[in-house]
């Protein structure tokens, strides 16, 4: 790494993955292991986020970049940048203070993560149930009771619900 | 009746961030999804992502997740999808669509949000 | 991530023809299939949802069919205006995905 020559911050020409050392007369140095820096000119290199635990690493840590982690099979993640791992349901459930709990009636969770909601009220849109809820999954809408010819039945019983559903994201 | 209307064209240099808007009428904002899908030049659709307005709740595709940021502001009925550290393979049509009555499909569209990224 | 294979990927027929498309998901999405409509000028339009549902106000010549991992969408007698890209969705499993497209074009 070249000694900078810039008559303003000699600092300012240390490319993404070194630092300016002040103890080697601000000499462009590389960051050391396990640590990093995103952007020229820094004094100083970020010292790598270690995924442990519950965490594992979804991307390493580079000169230049941070390390990424997400959540261990049976978690998900929350938070900016996935600073918090929290555990899975099944679909048509819940996470409580007291663990997984299964959704009240007229509500539904067809993901892993997440609450239970309300089945959707197709009324709001002049449309009738198509198919009825369940725990794992909503209703499907259809068409106004008036669309429907007549001796058509509107309600179709839900489809079983199947494992995995909707993947945690 | 139902309307969703997009944000202009956005021409950006590679590194920077485009923030489209997709603002909702003719319905409750706040009781349907609202989706983000990409159309690259030539190709096919693409689902990045969906949020439920009344509590914010967001689902993302993997491929997106470092990409996109979805949120809504529920006073204007408006949703928005930022991308950012935008690349030439973020050149695309994005549209944002409502679910039909439960988020299983999509039945309103918007027009379409034409963003070229270009040096 | 659900694939969803589409065939053909492009079409050509003559007016009054019938026109069918099928969409193959990589595993079991019950009934969650939804097929729309893209016209030349960008436009995206629900034609069915739920696999055989008409959208209201969508003509009667569409329609569709099946369940599992085999689907097909039919226009019983081809119009002018049906020249457009076909794009089939699962709806069954984040993240929603959508077949290629079929292309079709008028003889």
């Known amino acids: 790494f070249e000694r900078t020559r810039s008559l303003q911050d000699p600092c300012s020409n240390c490319p993404a993955g070194t630092f300016c050392d002040n103890n080697r007369n601000q000499i462009c140095s590389p960051c050391p292991p396990n640590s990093f820096s995103s952007a020229g000119g820094q004094r100083t290199c970020d010292i790598c986020r270690q995924c442990k635990g519950v965490f594992r690493t979804r991307k390493e840590c580079s000169s230049t970049s941070n390390a990424e982690c997400d959540c261990t099979p049976g978690f998900h993640c929350l938070g900016a940048g996935c600073s918090m791992c929290e555990q899975d349901c099944k679909q048509g459930q819940e996470l409580t203070k007291k663990g997984c709990k299964d959704c009240c009636f007229g509500t539904f969770n067809d993901q892993k993560r997440g609450i239970c909601r309300p089945w959707t009220n197709c009324s709001l849109d002049g449309k009738s149930v198509l198919v009825n809820g369940t725990k794992e999954r909503d209703v499907v809408c259809g068409p106004s009771p008036a669309d429907l010819s007549p001796g058509a039945s509107s309600v179709t019983p839900p489809a079983p619900a199947r494992e995995p559903g909707h993947s945690p994201q | 009746q139902v309307q969703l209307v997009q944000s202009g064209a956005e021409v950006k240099k590679p590194g920077a961030s485009v923030k489209v808007s997709c603002k909702a009428s003719g319905y409750t904002f706040t009781s349907y999804w609202i989706n983000w899908v990409k159309q690259a030049p030539g190709q096919g659709l693409e689902w990045a992502g969906n949020i439920y307005p009344s509590d914010s709740y967001t689902n993302y595709n993997q491929k997106f997740k470092d990409k996109a940021t979805i949120t809504a502001d529920k006073s204007t009925s408006t949703a928005y999808m930022e991308l950012s550290s935008l690349r030439s393979e973020d050149t695309a049509v994005y549209y944002c669509?409502?679910?039909?009555?439960?988020?299983?499909?999509?039945?309103?569209w918007g027009q379409g949000t034409t963003v070229t990224v270009s040096s | 991530d659900i694939q969803m294979t589409q065939s053909p990927s492009s079409l050509s027929a003559s007016v009054g023809d019938r026109v069918t498309i099928t969409c193959r998901p990589s595993?079991?999405?019950?009934?969650?299939l939804n097929w729309y409509q893209q016209k030349p000028d960008k436009t995206v339009k629900l034609l069915i949802y739920?696999?055989?549902r008409l959208r209201s106000g969508v003509p009667s010549r569409f329609s569709g069919s099946g369940s599992g991992t085999d689907f097909t969408f039919t226009i019983s007698s081809l119009q002018p205006e049906d020249i457009a890209t076909y794009f089939c969705q699962q709806g069954d499993t984040l993240p929603y995905t959508f077949g290629q497209g079929t292309k079709l074009e008028i003889k």
């Open positions: 739920y696999t055989s």
């Open positions: 595993q079991d999405i019950s009934n969650y």
């Open positions: 669509t409502r679910d039909y009555g439960s988020a299983y499909s999509m039945s309103t």
